[in-house]
C-alpha cells in the first residue's frame, strides 16, 4: 500500500466544554469580525481531532503551506424556553468563517444563517449549521469561526467542529 | 492528461426506496448507537453511486486503506403534521455518523440536529440535514449513519446519501 | 515545499448581486430541471472565487478532466414575512444540483430542502442550505445549481456559492 502520510495537510478540531475562554471577548483583536470567535477548540482527542501540518493558535488554524483548502465548520445551537422578561422570541443563529491575511482586518469567507422558530408555543430549539468551501490560502494566513448567540452553542466534540484540508 | 485512477479511495452511496431492511432493527448489533442505522444504501446506480477501494457491508462503509477521510452524509426528513386533539408532538431529527473499530461499541464522530416547527399552523415539514468532517480511519474500520425518526426519511437517491473519500 | 499547483482541478464561484441575469428564464434550455438555474456566479474575485482547470459558462461549471469530484453549493434564502389575509405563509426552499452529460436532459445529483416557519408570529426568515457529494464526471459534463423561490436568494459572495474539486 502506498504511503500517503507525508502528503497530508489537514485538521479537524472539535468543541470542548467547560472552559472559560471558549469564546473571545467582544473587544478582542477580531472586533472587526461579526459574531464572537470560538477559541476553545481541541486538537488532540484521540480518534476525534487532529492537526497535520497546520497549527492551532488562539482558536485559529494557521496555514503552513499555500494552496487551495476546503474549509468547513459545524456549530450546534441548542436552547430552551426560559422565563426571561424583555427577551425577543426569535434568535438569529449565524456562523461565520473568516481569514486573516497580512491585511489588518479579517476577511469574511462564508456565512450561514438560521433563525429560530417564531411560535409562542416553542419549547426548545435544535439547529446545526454546517458550511464549507474552497479557498486559496497562503503561508501564515489564519482562519477562524465566529458565531452569534454564542451562549447557545453545544460544544460537544461531535456536535461543533472546524476543519480544513489541502486539495490537490 | 495524467492518470489519477489508482489513487482513488472514495464512495458515494445513495438512498434506495421500498426495501424492508432500510433501517436496522432497534435491537440489532448497534444497539449502543443512538438512533437507527440506515442499512439500505445503493452503491452502483450509474452516475449516482459508486464504491472505489471501499466496501459496503450491512449499511457500513468498510475501510481498506488507513488515512484521513472526509466523511459526509445527508438525510432528508419529510412529513405531514398530524394535529391530534390539541397536542403537537415536536420531532427531533438527528443524524449521527459513527465508526466501529476493534473496540466493541460504536464511536460517535458527528451529530447534527433539527427540531420541527412548533406552530399549530404547520401542515408539513421538509428538513435536510448535511454534515461532514475529517477523521482518521484504519483498515477494517466501519462507518455508518443512524437517524432518529427514521420513518420520516425520504430515501430518494438524490435526497439522502452517504460518502467518504481519502484526503491527501 | 513541494509544488502542488499543476495537480489542482478545483473551483469556488460566488454569488454576485445586481445582475439582471442572475437566474435563468423559466423557459431556458434547462426547463426539464426543477427550480431556476442560478446563472450569475463570479469566478475571479480575489481571495474569494477562482477557477482552476474548470470553466464557467452560462452559470455551469464545465469539466475538463474526468474523475470523481466533490461538488457542493450553499444558497442563502432571506425574506421578510408578509402578512396577507387568508394566505398561507409557508415557503418551500429547495436547492438542486444537476449535471448535463451527452444525454439531452439534466440529471439531478442532489437536492436539499427546507420549509419556512409556519407561525403567524414570524417576521422574517433566514435559511442557508448547504449540500455536497462525490460524483463521477466526464470531460465536457456541466454542473449547475437551481433553486425554488429564487427571488429570496441573497447573492452575497460569502452567503451563496458553488464549487467542486477533483478527488484523488
Amino acid at each position: 500500500v502506498r504511503e500517503r502520510g507525508p502528503q497530508r495537510v489537514a485538521a479537524h478540531i472539535t468543541g470542548t466544554r467547560g472552559r472559560s475562554n471558549t469564546l473571545s471577548s467582544p473587544n478582542s483583536k477580531n472586533e472587526k469580525a461579526l459574531g464572537r470567535k470560538i477559541n476553545s477548540w481541541e486538537s488532540s482527542r484521540s480518534g476525534h481531532s487532529f492537526l497535520s501540518n497546520l497549527h492551532l493558535r488562539n482558536g485559529e488554524l494557521v496555514i503552513q503551506e499555500k494552496g487551495f483548502y476546503y474549509i468547513y465548520s459545524q456549530t450546534y445551537f441548542r436552547f430552551q424556553e426560559e422565563i426571561k422578561e424583555n427577551t425577543k422570541n426569535d434568535k438569529q443563529m449565524v456562523q461565520y468563517i473568516y481569514k486573516y491575511t497580512s491585511y489588518p482586518d479579517p476577511i469574511l469567507l462564508m456565512k450561514s444563517a438560521r433563525n429560530s422558530c417564531w411560535s409562542k408555543d416553542a419549547e426548545y430549539g435544535l439547529y446545526s449549521i454546517y458550511q464549507g468551501g474552497l479557498f486559496e490560502l497562503k503561508k501564515d494566513d489564519r482562519i477562524f469561526v465566529s458565531v452569534t448567540n454564542e451562549h447557545l452553542i453545544d460544544m460537544d466534540h461531535e456536535a461543533s467542529f472546524f476543519g480544513a484540508f489541502l486539495v490537490g | 492528461v495524467r492518470e489519477r485512477g489508482p489513487q482513488r479511495v472514495a464512495a458515494h452511496i445513495t438512498g434506495t426506496r421500498g426495501r424492508s431492511n432500510t433501517l436496522s432493527s432497534p435491537n440489532s448489533k448497534n444497539e449502543k448507537a443512538l438512533g437507527r442505522k440506515i442499512n439500505s444504501w445503493e452503491s452502483s446506480r450509474s452516475g449516482h453511486s459508486f464504491l472505489s477501494n471501499l466496501h459496503l457491508r450491512n449499511g457500513e462503509l468498510v475501510i481498506q486503506e488507513k488515512g484521513f477521510y472526509y466523511i459526509y452524509s445527508q438525510t432528508y426528513f419529510r412529513f405531514q403534521e398530524e394535529i391530534k386533539e390539541n397536542t403537537k408532538n415536536d420531532k427531533q431529527m438527528v443524524q449521527y455518523i459513527y465508526k466501529y473499530t476493534s473496540y466493541p461499541d460504536p464511536i460517535l464522530l458527528m451529530k447534527s440536529a433539527r427540531n420541527s416547527c412548533w406552530s399549530k399552523d404547520a401542515e408539513y415539514g421538509l428538513y435536510s440535514i448535511y454534515q461532514g468532517g475529517l477523521f482518521e480511519l484504519k483498515k477494517d474500520d466501519r462507518i455508518f449513519v443512524s437517524v432518529t425518526n427514521e420513518h420520516l426519511i425520504d430515501m430518494d437517491h438524490e435526497a439522502s446519501f452517504f460518502g467518504a473519500f481519502l484526503v491527501g | 515545499v513541494r509544488e502542488r499547483g499543476p495537480q489542482r482541478v478545483a473551483a469556488h464561484i460566488t454569488g454576485t448581486r445586481g445582475r439582471s441575469n442572475t437566474l435563468s428564464s423559466p423557459n431556458s434550455k434547462n426547463e426539464k430541471a426543477l427550480g431556476r438555474k442560478i446563472n450569475s456566479w463570479e469566478s475571479s474575485r480575489s481571495g474569494h472565487s477562482f477557477l482552476s482547470n474548470l470553466h464557467l459558462r452560462n452559470g455551469e461549471l464545465v469539466i475538463q478532466e474526468k474523475g470523481f469530484y466533490y461538488i457542493y453549493s450553499q444558497t442563502y434564502f432571506r425574506f421578510q414575512e408578509e402578512i396577507k389575509e387568508n394566505t398561507k405563509n409557508d415557503k418551500q426552499m429547495v436547492q438542486y444540483i444537476y449535471k448535463y452529460t451527452s444525454y439531452p436532459d439534466p440529471i439531478l445529483l442532489m437536492k436539499s430542502a427546507r420549509n419556512s416557519c409556519w407561525s403567524k408570529d414570524a417576521e422574517y426568515g433566514l435559511y442557508s442550505i448547504y449540500q455536497g457529494g462525490l460524483f463521477e464526471l466526464k470531460k465536457d459534463d456541466r454542473i449547475f445549481v437551481s433553486v425554488t423561490n429564487e427571488h429570496l436568494i441573497d447573492m452575497d459572495h460569502e452567503a451563496s456559492f458553488f464549487g467542486a474539486f477533483l478527488v484523488g
Partner: antibody, heavy 115, light 107 residues
Framework: EVMLVESGGGLVQPGGSLKLSCAAS????????MSWVRQTPEKRLEWVAT????????YYPDNLKGRFTISRENAKNTLYLQMSSLRSEDTAMYYC????????WGQGTSVTVSS | DILLTQSPSSLSASLGERVSLTCRAS??????LSWLQQKPDGTIKRLIY???TLDSGVPKRFSGSRSGSDYSLTISSLESDDFADYYC?????????FGGGTKLEIK
Amino acid sequence: EVMLVESGGGLVQPGGSLKLSCAASGFTFSNYGMSWVRQTPEKRLEWVATISGGGSYTYYPDNLKGRFTISRENAKNTLYLQMSSLRSEDTAMYYCAAPTAMDYWGQGTSVTVSS
Amino acid sequence: DILLTQSPSSLSASLGERVSLTCRASQEISGFLSWLQQKPDGTIKRLIYAASTLDSGVPKRFSGSRSGSDYSLTISSLESDDFADYYCLQYASYPRTFGGGTKLEIK
C-alpha cells in the same frame, strides 16, 4: 421574583372530583407553558399535564387522558387542573411548575383519595 | 416513552466528600435534562438544566455533565445543606419523565 402557589387540595372520595389552582406571579404568565407534576406517597415524581402559553396545546400521559383536564386563565395568571373519577392511586402531592422545562416549582397541594 | 434510570437509589456520604449521581436515558434527549433537589420539607428546586448549565444562585460545587446517553450530577464537596433527594427530568419529549430519585443521606 417568580412565585407559584397551589391551592384546592384536600380529601375526596373515590369517584369524586377536585379542581386545583396555581396562582402565578413575577413573570408574563401568558408567554409560557405550564405543567402539573405529582409526587406519590412512595416519593416517585410523575408528570400529570402541560399546557402551552396560549393554551393551544395540552399534553397528558396516556393513563390520565380523559380524567384530568389542564386549563389556564391568562387574564388571572392562573393555572388549573380539573380531576374527575378520582382513584386511590391519585393520592399525591400536586405541584405546578413553569415553564415547560420546569424551572420553577410551587410548594405543592396535597390530594388524598380515600373512602 | 423515554425511560430515565437513575442510580444509586440511595447514598450515604460524609461532609466534604465528592459524590456523583447518574441518569441514563433510553433514547436521545439532546441534552434536555435537568436535575432537581427536594428538601425534607417538600420544596423542589432546579439545580441544573440543559445537562450542564447551573441555575443562578446554585453553589458552584454542583455540576452536571453528559457522556452520550449518560448524564451525571456531581457535588464536589458535600455540605450539610446538600443532604436531600435528587431527581433527573427529561423535557425533550412528551410524556415528560423523571428518574426514580436518589436519597442522599449523611454518613
